[in-house]
Amino acid sequence: IWELKKDVYVVELDWYPDAPGEMVVLTCDTPEEDGITWTLDQSSEVLGSGKTLTIQVKEFGDAGQYTCHKGGEVLSHSLLLLHKKEDGIWSTDILKDQKEPKNKTFLRCEAKNYSGRFTCWWLTTISTDLTFSVKSSRGSSDPQGVTCGAATLSAERVRGDNKEYEYSVECQEDSACPAAEESLPIEVMVDAVHKLKYENYTSSFFIRDIIKPDPPKNLQLKPLKNSRQVEVSWEYPDTWSTPHSYFSLTFCVQVQGKSKREKKDRVFTDKTSATVICRKNASISVRAQDRYYSSSWSEWASVPCS
């Protein structure tokens, strides 16, 4: 058993059918010695008397808010949550496996640049009685500070007969050095509590591996005289690291017909312009990627040929 926060305790339960459970001793936070009784949640049934209460925690029915009283007055509370292990594996019931980029991916994180700011998000089908707490650091043995905000509900969507909820959090490395080579990964830890169930989820990454630039901005077409060709131009996104001479992007320019089946023409360039043939009813799209490190491509910025 360990303390999650004041008066909230997590019991680690290795569960299997007929498991003996965990013996837990609760102590009433009071100088009083006599006439103390214990109850669980809203029940008036007295579970025991005395300054300490010993319970055998076998299942969620044994978790909840234990209260010690004296003469009708509440002395203190202890909320017991369960962290369940089955077949040697801690439960991961609260969050949905996003399966990208691999199985057992519960947390996904992205950064728009090298400033040390990043966003993580996760999915759940649970809509109520749910709280998250996020901590982060650079490295784990001698951790350097990363400050995370509160997790917030960022999207809701329907998937089949299921409603899915997306939560996200923004974090900022306290003393980020954008140009430095990373040697220690960022660690992100999410505590999730649903009703009386506690779970924790972790992710470890280098900022360079989670970079995903914003799409190029100010995408424009300039027709070339007496030609079906156009000059496409764009700019680096505002959110990208500066100076651009050091933090350089490479670009992919794509001409896509109205039909998805039509052949796509693609051009790769390090410049912020390109000359392409603009077909009728086609659209031109441009996306960006770090020039020197193969992290994610940005989403596409698009304009119609017409």
Partner: nanobody, 123 residues
Framework: EVQLVESGGGVVQAGESLRLSCAAS????????MGWFRQAPGTEREFVGA????????YYADSAKGRFTISRDNAKNTVFLQMSSLKPEDTAVYYC????????????????WGQGTQVTVSS
Amino acid sequence: EVQLVESGGGVVQAGESLRLSCAASGRSFSNYEMGWFRQAPGTEREFVGAINRRGSSTYYADSAKGRFTISRDNAKNTVFLQMSSLKPEDTAVYYCAAGWLFPSSRSRDYDYWGQGTQVTVSS
């Protein structure tokens, strides 16, 4: 929201078997841990057993161990209670319930309940 409808109850002789079904509709059935409870006249609702969302673990009250088996078919949104060697003291209304916490024998840990199906065991 999940709606639950029990079926399969009836009158049987002591020593016989009965299979109860609970059909779920509404939000995704496979998200929920499922439990069976029963209530005899004049008594509190009593836990019978539960099964986790994947159907890989079950949990039974002492009174059900060795005689009752819970299973589920997530493709058909149904949970089953197979009861054998029935005794007159098994006579009760049997309820199926859906919740988020497994294992739990506590009725308030279940959020959705069916209307129940009557099982009568005569001697």
